[in-house]
């Protein structure tokens, strides 16, 4: 695709290129033959990220506590306020628009990936030699008591949701 | 002062191309864009297409995009407006404004017939 | 694209009469509009762009107006001189587009 009749940063308008306003600043009046393009700076709580023909800021985005948000780093005149989840919670979109709490592994699950701001919990089912036998968005799947280093024996078999129970050795009389 | 002088009229064939210049002086050649219209027998105005001498970057009307090319030469401030296989509609005056703040100032227009 | 439409399409109007020239764009063109005045023989004159900056050298009887979709143009005593037709263009989105055009003739 060849060159366009205006360079990078400019714009074409009326049969002439004019300066787009940078990031941060808005467009108040396009440039004529004889004024250069007049930009001024985005207010307090607005955002503009590129560079720009536009005639109004954006709004920085606000993080509703009631839906579970809160601001991860603060919006600037150039950037807008990413917001991330409460403890506890985790976005529901990549625009993290809403929370919702973590997802708690059940029993015979446990949590192979820890929920994030962003992310939620990932359970796996415990494999054989591993259980879980409480709901838990931490835990991870335990492996069942070793009887034999104890010098017990397996009294009954471990499932993925209960430890082997160990007892003693049958004793010889 | 500004002055824009296109190349004389031309008789083409259907299927033909035809380049038309428009010699620019004035001004600093580089520092305003050309615009180039054309204006059918008693119709209006319609636009083609617009360079940037300072670059060669240009932006064109889709009704002509792939036959219309526009270029310019800052060596003889000249700007060129061809347009290829030629049919009978093509018939009109052509001509190339300077622009800046609306086409400020036109060529003369030229003159081109497309007849077998 | 945007659709220019301009009327009325012929204004027959006296000497030292006004005359008023309408154009009508087919959505908001910011008032990036132009006004051009061709006679036969000439080259095209740019009167007014930007809806109301009159060109150097365009004599004071010429002033345009409007916004969003209306714009006018208006000759406030029509000169011998004035006796031509008039395109209003748009300059405000690509491919730029003209009105038809308004003959303004001696009445």
């Known amino acids: 695709e060849p060159p366009t009749a205006c360079r990078e940063k400019q714009y074409l308008i009326n049969s002439q290129c004019c300066s787009l306003c940078q990031p941060g600043q808005k467009l108040v009046s396009d440039c004529t033959e004889f004024t250069e393009t007049e930009c001024l700076p985005c207010g307090e709580s607005e955002f503009l990220d590129t560079w720009n023909r536009e005639t109004h800021c954006h709004q920085h985005k606000y993080c509703d506590p009631n839906l579970g948000l809160r601001v991860q780093q603060k919006g600037t005149s150039e950037t807008d306020t990413i917001c991330t989840c409460e403890e506890g919670w985790h976005c529901t979109s990549e625009a993290c628009e809403s929370c919702v709490l973590h997802r708690s592994c059940s029993p015979g699950f446990g949590v192979k990936q820890i929920a994030t701001g962003v992310s939620d919990t990932i359970c796996e089912p415990c494999p054989v030699g591993f259980f879980s036998n409480v709901s838990s968005a931490f835990e991870k799947c335990h492996p069942w008591t070793s009887c034999e280093t104890k010098d017990l024996v397996v009294q009954q078999a471990g499932t993925n949701k209960t430890d082997v129970v160990c007892g003693p050795q049958d004793r010889l009389r | 002062q500004v002055q824009l002088v296109q190349s004389g009229a031309e008789v083409k064939k259907p299927g033909s191309s035809v380049k038309v210049s428009c010699k620019a002086s004035?001004?600093?050649?580089?520092?305003?864009?050309i615009e180039w219209v054309r204006q059918a027998p008693g119709q209006g105005l319609e636009w083609i297409g617009v360079?940037?001498?300072?670059?060669?970057?240009?932006n064109y009307n889709e009704k002509f995009k792939g036959r219309a090319t526009l270029t310019a030469d800052k060596s003889t401030s000249t700007a060129y407006m061809e347009l290829s296989s030629l049919r009978s509609e093509d018939t009109a005056v052509y001509f190339c404004?300077?622009?800046?703040?609306?086409?400020?100032?036109w060529g003369q227009g030229t003159l081109v017939t497309v007849s077998s | 694209e945007i659709v220019m439409t301009q009327s009325p399409a012929t204004l027959s109007v006296s000497p030292g009469e006004r005359a008023t020239l309408s154009c009508r764009a087919s959505q908001d063109i910011s008032n990036h509009l132009n006004w051009y005045q061709q006679k036969p023989g000439q080259a095209v004159r740019l009167l007014i762009s930007s809806t109301s900056r009159l060109h150097s050298g365009i004599p004071a009887r010429f002033s345009g107006s409007g916004s969003g979709t209306e714009y006018t143009l208006t000759i406030s005593s029509l000169q011998s001189e004035d006796f031509a037709v008039y395109f209003c263009q748009q300059g405000n989105t690509l491919p730029w587009t003209f009105g038809q055009g308004t003959k303004v003739e001696i009445k």
């Open positions: 360079i940037n001498p300072g670059y060669g970057g240009v």
């Open positions: 004035g001004y600093g050649f580089t520092n305003y864009l």
């Open positions: 404004a300077r622009g800046g703040s609306g086409f400020a100032f």
